[in-house]
């Protein structure tokens, strides 16, 4: 699988979830969550040659058309599989809401 | 929505789906299958700007990060949103067989 | 349902050569391409060569060295390997593409070694 623990532990160009922390106050401006300070978003990218860990049978007909047709311009996209939400702690005045966003998170890649 | 109706009659430069015919047989080298000959199978490509049909949380703060950062190599990728089957016919021996291949034809696309 | 055997893996010296088989057993129709590839300790399993009906595709690496080739009458699928390299090191896996679903082969190790 296109995930963390191979990604995170190879050099590999092609096609992986790669490592991205966000510091939520100096990368997006947001003054509002209070924990964590930021966290790791992680993002996927590298190209996706051949048949590379196919998503859809879309996917697989596009992966072998590029495949035979190496002038093609048409190929799948490396883009994040599974996902794990965060949660966050912010203010509502001076109550304090604990908050689980979705989907927060990439844990490994497909191409798509 | 990024789908055929709109993509198809614009000009758009950002992610939209993109028309591909693929000929079995020129394209993919298939013999096996008798009807179609070949189908529009469509892409998705193009830049994924700010906000532009962000598929999840994370799409959404990957591209607010990369609007904020434009020096950053993260950006969401333009995907395939909708998929529709495609029906083929092909022989095993002299028997005619009809199968519905699911995910064969990209109508929208999203950022993801 | 498909089944594949692979064959033919073994170790040899840089410049040598060796030929895989894969027999394909089961059900056999509606195939998108067959194909080898192979995985080195610790990393993905990545495409060798493939062939559709009439087409063939090489990766880079492997390229005027290895050749595919398919019997579809006897349902086999053969890699002639060529002038061998250390890197070409890896498990071998026989791959079949049925209507859009993979087959895998339970591999066959390739040591190329002096």
């Known amino acids: 699988a296109l995930d963390t623990n191979y990604c995170f532990r190879n050099l590999e160009e092609n096609c992986c979830v790669r490592p991205l922390y966000i510091d939520f106050r100096q990368d997006l401006g947001w003054k509002w969550v209070h924990e964590p300070k930021g966290y790791y978003a992680n993002f996927c990218s590298g190209p996706c040659p051949y048949l590379r860990s196919a998503d859809t049978t879309h996917s697989t007909v596009l992966g072998l058309y590029n495949t035979l047709n190496p002038e093609a311009s048409a190929s799948p996209c490396c883009v994040p599989q599974d996902l794990e939400p965060l949660t966050i702690l912010y203010y509502v005045g001076r109550t304090p809401k604990v908050e689980q966003l979705s989907n927060m998170v990439v844990k490994s890649c497909k191409c798509s | 929505a990024l789908d055929t109706n709109y993509c198809f009659r614009n000009l758009e430069e950002n992610c939209c789906v993109r028309p591909l015919y693929i000929d079995f047989r020129q394209d993919l080298g298939w013999k096996w299958v008798h009807e179609p000959k070949g189908y529009y199978a469509n892409f998705c490509s193009g830049p994924c700007p700010y906000l532009r049909s962000a598929d999840t949380t994370h799409s959404t703060v990957l591209g607010l990060y990369n609007t904020l950062n434009p020096e950053a190599s993260a950006s969401p990728c333009c995907v395939p949103q909708d998929l529709e089957p495609l029906t083929i016919l092909y022989y095993v021996g002299r028997t005619p067989k009809v199968e519905q291949l699911s995910n064969m034809v990209v109508k929208s696309c999203k950022c993801s | 349902q498909v089944q594949l055997v692979e064959s033919g893996g073994g170790l040899v010296q840089p410049g040598e050569s060796l030929r895989l088989s894969c027999t394909a057993s089961?059900?056999?129709?509606?195939?998108?391409?067959m194909g080898w590839f192979r995985q080195a300790p610790g990393k993905q399993r990545d495409m060798v060569a493939i062939?559709?009906?009439?087409?063939?595709s090489y990766a880079d690496s492997v390229k005027g060295r290895f050749t595919i080739s398919r019997d579809n009458a006897k349902n086999t699928l053969a890699l002639q390997m060529n002038s061998l390299k250390p890197e070409d090191t890896a498990v071998y896996f026989c791959?079949?593409?049925?209507?859009?679903?993979?087959?895998w082969g339970p591999g066959t190790q390739v040591t190329v070694s002096s």
């Open positions: 791959n079949l593409n049925q209507l859009g679903t993979d087959y």
């Open positions: 062939s559709t009906d009439d087409r063939t």
């Open positions: 089961g059900s056999i129709f509606g195939v998108f391409y």
